[in-house]
Interface confidence: low
């Protein structure tokens, strides 16, 4: 293309793109001649005004095409254009380099640990089908109708039974492969399994042999029973259960070796199957000796039940247990089968719920724990398995014995209820990485308090402060106890309190933190590099 043509092109551009810059003299003249043909004097005056305006406008039309080209080609403007162009590209390259540096220097995301399904949330025990469902409804078919409720609790597994045939203290009349007809049939069980699977609820079957008898393991015929258990594991694994529970293992001679054998069968079938052992022992030595020989065993015990309800003692128990078990996955409960209310006064239930859901490991609850079900408050009910309070008609024995706020129905409608707290905690526990598999660091916060941090890589972090005492306390959060990777910020947002009256979502200054009696706080704060 010639230089001349280039100039022509520029002119075309000027003509096309900036018509408002063209001189307006010709247009003004046309207007005048038009006005001269008019007879109406009023219009004449108006046209004269227009003419004056047009003349004024002509003075401010900007540069003509020639002037503009001349100025644009002057050395000053050429230099300016080059400088701006250079600046643009330098900026662009700078941003590119910055992005590369940021990407290269950004800390690598920490590799997620292998997560089994029982690592992702709570387990829910239904040891007594009839008590769970209420009068005359305690069978597998009825339980199927309660799966939606379990889904609403966001629990990951249902620990069911025992439901096998067992004639009290009679080995010959105990059949771990047969479902007691009172509970239903094998078909009912298969149907329950299918429905549970659809709702992503795993089913763990309790195979404690002599559950109706004096000694859960028929102490005199251990080998016979062990063989029965082995056969039952094979049978029920094939049937599709996700795991097994055996309780009272302190009554089982050579428990460690049997558990190791049963674990091998369970894991041999699939790594995704779980074996839970339960013991009434609260002795750490005994608990550890059971764990030592059994990798991946989930053990429920009474270890935390003698925490004496003080912050220091609970902290000491928890940290001692975690130190002793090392990197092993733990479970947290107050016993192998009983309700929280068997061990705790009502005012500590919320605190313990918060703690059990936020410690590193799997929280394990019994049916009714989510509503504070208390056998002592229900006349004539057995401590081990009181009737579940679905609504006020669940306990017809004594009219008026049950108020709405004791029931699932009543608590579901109350956002401040224990059940609502349980649901919120369960939801957080199942979706927040720091609570799912985060590191745990306990630190000093003052007498009567137990506080700890859960954090995972660059994810949101959680601070838990628990006041076990019956007086209000100021928390002196001594972050000096914490490693640099888990340092505390000046402020953290309140996710929830176990007591009403606090504004959730509001930032709290950690140096000025005051807790009400029996109050627990769950606070969140972002990762800071």
């Amino acid at each position: 293309m010639s230089q001349d043509t280039e100039v022509d092109m520029k002119e075309v551009e000027l003509n096309e793109l900036e018509p408002e810059k063209q001189p307006m003299n010709a247009a003004s003249g046309a207007a005048m001649s038009l006005a001269g043909a008019e007879k109406n004097g009023l219009v004449k005056i108006k046209v004269a005004e227009d003419e004056a305006e047009a003349a004024a406008a002509a003075k401010f039309t900007g540069l003509s095409k020639e002037e503009l080209l001349k100025v644009a080609g002057s050395p000053g403007w050429v230099r300016t254009r080059w400088a701006l162009l250079l600046l643009f590209w330098l900026g662009w390259l700078g941003m590119l380099a910055g992005a590369v540096v940021i990407i290269v220097r950004a800390p690598r995301c920490r590799e997620l640990p292998a997560q089994k399904w029982w690592h992702t949330g709570a387990l829910y025990r239904i040891g007594d089908l009839q008590a769970f469902q209420g009068h005359g409804a305690g069978n597998l078919a009825g339980l199927k109708g309660r799966l939606d409720y379990l889904s609403s609790l966001k629990v990951k597994g249902l620990v069911l039974g025992p439901i096998h045939k067992n004639q009290k203290d009679d080995v010959a009349q105990t059949d771990l492969l047969q479902i007691d007809p009172n509970f239903g049939s094998k078909e009912d069980f298969d149907s329950l399994l299918q429905s549970a699977k659809k709702k992503s609820i795993r089913v763990i079957l309790d195979l404690t042999p002599n559950y109706r008898g004096e000694n859960s393991w028929f102490s005199t015929q251990v080998d016979t029973v062990a063989t029965k258990v082995k056969d039952a594991l094979e049978f029920w694994l094939q049937a599709g259960v996700d795991g097994f529970q055996v309780r009272d293992i302190e009554n089982l001679k050579d428990a460690s070796s049997f558990l190791a054998e049963w674990q091998n069968i369970t894991k041999g079938f699939s790594e995704d199957r779980l074996l839970i052992a339960g013991t009434n022992s609260s002795d750490l030595q005994q608990i550890l000796s059971l764990l030592e020989s059994n990798k991946d065993l989930l053990l429920t015990s009474s270890y935390l039940s003698d925490s004496g309800s003080t912050g220091e003692h609970t902290k000491s128990l928890v940290t001692q247990y975690l130190n002793a078990t090392g990197n092993r996955w733990c479970s947290w409960s107050l016993s192998q089968a009983r309700l929280l209310t068997s061990f705790l006064p009502a005012q500590l239930l919320r605190l313990y719920q918060l703690m059990l859901f936020t410690l590193p490991g799997t929280p394990v609850f019994s049916y009714g724990d989510e509503i504070g079900l208390d056998a002592a408050a229900l006349p004539g009910q057995p401590m081990e398995a009181p009737v579940m309070l679905w609504d006020e008609s669940s306990f017809p024995d004594i009219p008026g014995a049950v108020s709405a706020n004791m029931t699932v129905k009543g608590q579901s409608e109350d956002p401040g209820s224990l059940l609502s707290l349980f649901r919120r905690l369960s939801d957080q526990r199942s979706k927040e990485r720091s609570l799912l598999h985060g590191d745990f660091h306990a630190f000093s916060a003052g007498p009567g308090l137990f506080s700890y941090i859960r954090h995972w890589d660059q994810n949101e972090r959680f601070l838990v402060v628990l006041n076990f005492g019956d007086v209000g306390l100021s928390a002196g959060l001594q972050a000096s106890d914490l490693p640099a990777s888990a340092s505390l910020p000046a402020k953290a947002d309140l996710l929830l309190s176990t007591q009403p009256g606090r504004e959730e979502g509001s930032p709290l200054e950690l140096e000025r933190l005051k807790l009400e009696p029996h109050e627990g706080l769950l606070l969140r704060f972002p990762y800071a590099a």
Epitope: Q285, Q320, N323, G326, D481
Partner: antibody
Framework: QIQLVQSGPELKKPGETVKISCKAS????????MNWVKQAPGKGLKWMGW????????TYADDFKGRFAFSLETSASTASLQINNLKNEDTATYFC???????????WGQGTSVTVSS | DIQLTQSPSSLSASLGERVSLTCRAS??????LSWLQQKPDGTIKRLIY???TLDSGVPKRFSGSRSGSDYSLTISSLESEDFADYYC?????????FGGGTKVEIK
Amino acid sequence: QIQLVQSGPELKKPGETVKISCKASGYSITNFGMNWVKQAPGKGLKWMGWVNTYTGEPTYADDFKGRFAFSLETSASTASLQINNLKNEDTATYFCTRSVITYTMDYWGQGTSVTVSS
Amino acid sequence: DIQLTQSPSSLSASLGERVSLTCRASQEISGYLSWLQQKPDGTIKRLIYAASTLDSGVPKRFSGSRSGSDYSLTISSLESEDFADYYCLQYASYPRTFGGGTKVEIK
């Protein structure tokens, strides 16, 4: 195999500070607590306390509160004992020994001799 | 604190001889007791834990037993490498405490 290797002997003057290290190998240091034990010349063993290696929290026996400090460098699998403002009666051999309740003090370091003399 | 009283404080014995050391606890320790051996070079090794469980690699001539609050370490047939100091240790409660020690010497 499991080993606890302690730092070498120390000769110090009263008032000075000494820091003894104990490097663990063959296992993960955070899975087991670490105890410290003192043995004065010609005397028996005395438990000084332990550090919870999972949380880093130290516990001191009554006679060892104040001038004594347990610390931990998890990344280096090392536990340390620091004694400040040394006195003549601190002259002793100090042992580190790992523990988990059932396995209390099953492996011991070789000991570090500290002599305090003006 | 739990006191452990060890006896005798020293004993002389010949090779092949059977010896017993005793440790008495001032309070109930429920079998949470171990026996330690300290060689002349100062190195310490645990021999027995939970009163009677032999550590792996420890010769079978060592055995532990319990009778009420009395705990014993028995060496069925002394060998030359057994001449050392022996300590009992309780781990039933804090603070952990040791016995005063027993020196086993060659006669």
